[in-house]
């Protein structure tokens, strides 16, 4: 009886189970009753990452420097090229097809997580006791100055954007 289903890494064609081509190889001809599936390796700029019956290999992704992209990992016959963004830029999507500049955290916000080639800067509001008076992609919220440790007193309260202003204590006459 001709098979209706095939084993793993096989496919059904002409009532026969044929072996799939291994990753890194493409299908040249289906198997017959006399020959196994004929496969050929993908060329240097191509890949196939699964057991397959593809007659064409996929082209490696091109990391276009005009879009701010650079090669993170060179493709092989079994894997695609992985792109990442140049310094100061990050990917606009998971597939990393283009890059945009990292955003800066505005005054009143500090950097919670510094941007990478694949993720943007994550900002957080400065909590009470902390401030940020700059627009930055690197600086965290900084603690207010402790006037007491300097034998000074708070003359002006701090905000999320400004540090406290310390001054000398009033001397008793």
């Amino acid at each position: 009886e001709p098979p209706t289903a095939c084993r793993e890494k096989q496919y059904l064609i002409n009532s026969q189970c044929c072996s799939l081509c291994q990753p890194g190889q493409k299908l040249v001809s289906d198997c017959t009753e006399f020959t196994e599936t004929e496969c050929l390796p993908c060329s240097e700029s191509e890949f196939l990452d699964t057991w397959n019956r593809e007659t064409r290999c996929h082209q490696h992704k091109y990391c276009d420097p005009n879009l701010g992209l650079q090669v993170q990992q060179k493709g092989t016959s079994e894997t695609d090229t992985i792109c990442t963004c140049e310094e100061g830029l990050h990917c606009t999507s998971e597939s990393c097809e283009s890059c945009v500049p990292h955003r800066s955290c505005l005054p009143g916000f500090g950097v919670k997580q510094i941007a990478t080639g694949v993720s943007d800067t994550i900002c957080e509001p400065c909590p009470v006791g902390f401030f940020s008076n700059v627009s930055s992609a690197f600086e965290k919220c900084r603690p207010w100055t402790s006037c007491e440790t300097k034998d000074l007193v708070v003359q002006q309260a701090g905000t999320n954007k400004t540090d406290v202003v310390c001054g000398p204590q009033d001397r008793q006459r």
Epitope: V28, S29, T32, E33, F34, T35, E36, E38
Partner: antibody, heavy 117, light 107 residues
């Protein structure tokens, strides 16, 4: 018991034709691909032709393509090899073989074809 | 066309000795290779399929190994009936091709 019995061999002049037959028994003939393999005197094995179980697909090496034709009659459990324009280099024992698991798992005893003037 | 080269052409050994026969393919054929034995005046018979798979009814002293381009048929301890010609055959692609054979003869 699987049996393959070839017949039709003999002495033939160059340029003439000959038809070999292979009677199969002991298995469901229509479920198997079949092939012809030959062996020139004192030489090695050479594949000559193959035919799929249903008879739709045939395969030949370049040196016999256009001259030899493989066919089968599943109702008669018989494999054929029609050989035309025979040459001296076609002189050989011709074996009928069954394709099982992509191997030639059973062979007939062979029939001798001699092409000579 | 895939060319199969068998070596040595002739192997002279005594019964009880180990025989190692080689078959080299002109390009990678994965494990798509069979081995056959032929005794004088007889038709060939299948010994090993898919490079290393044993055949029912074939003595366990016969074993095959290899993948890609280099294959080996090993007879662990030669019996008198093992002196014969051995052929490898590829079924990776058309045309089907055989090696030229290795004759194992009594020393």
């Amino acid at each position: 018991e699987v049996q393959l019995v070839e017949s039709g061999g003999g002495v033939v002049q160059p340029g003439r034709s000959l038809r070999l037959s292979c009677a199969a028994s002991g298995f469901t003939f229509s479920n198997y691909g079949m092939s012809w393999v030959r062996q020139a005197p004192g030489k090695g094995l050479e594949w000559v032709a193959s035919i799929s179980s249903g008879g739709d697909d045939t395969y030949y090496p370049d040196n016999v393509k256009g001259r030899f034709t493989i066919s089968r009659d599943n109702s008669k459990n018989t494999l054929y090899l029609q050989m035309n324009s025979l040459r001296a280099e076609d002189t050989a024992v011709y074996y009928c073989t069954r394709a099982g698991g992509k191997a030639m798992d059973y062979w007939g005893q062979g029939t001798l074809v001699t092409v000579s003037s | 066309e895939i060319v199969l080269t068998q070596s040595p052409a002739t192997l002279s050994l005594s019964p009880g000795e180990r025989a190692t026969l080689s078959c080299r393919a002109s390009q990678s054929i994965r494990d798509n290779l069979h081995w056959y034995q032929q005794k004088p005046g007889q038709a060939p018979r299948l010994l090993i399929y898919y490079a290393s798979q044993s055949i029912s009814g074939i003595p366990a002293r016969f074993s095959g190994s290899g993948s890609g381009t280099d294959f080996t048929l090993t007879i662990s301890s030669l019996e008198p009936e093992d002196f014969a010609v051995y052929y490898c055959q590829q079924f990776n692609s058309w045309p089907l091709t055989f090696g030229q054979g290795t004759k194992v003869e009594i020393k």
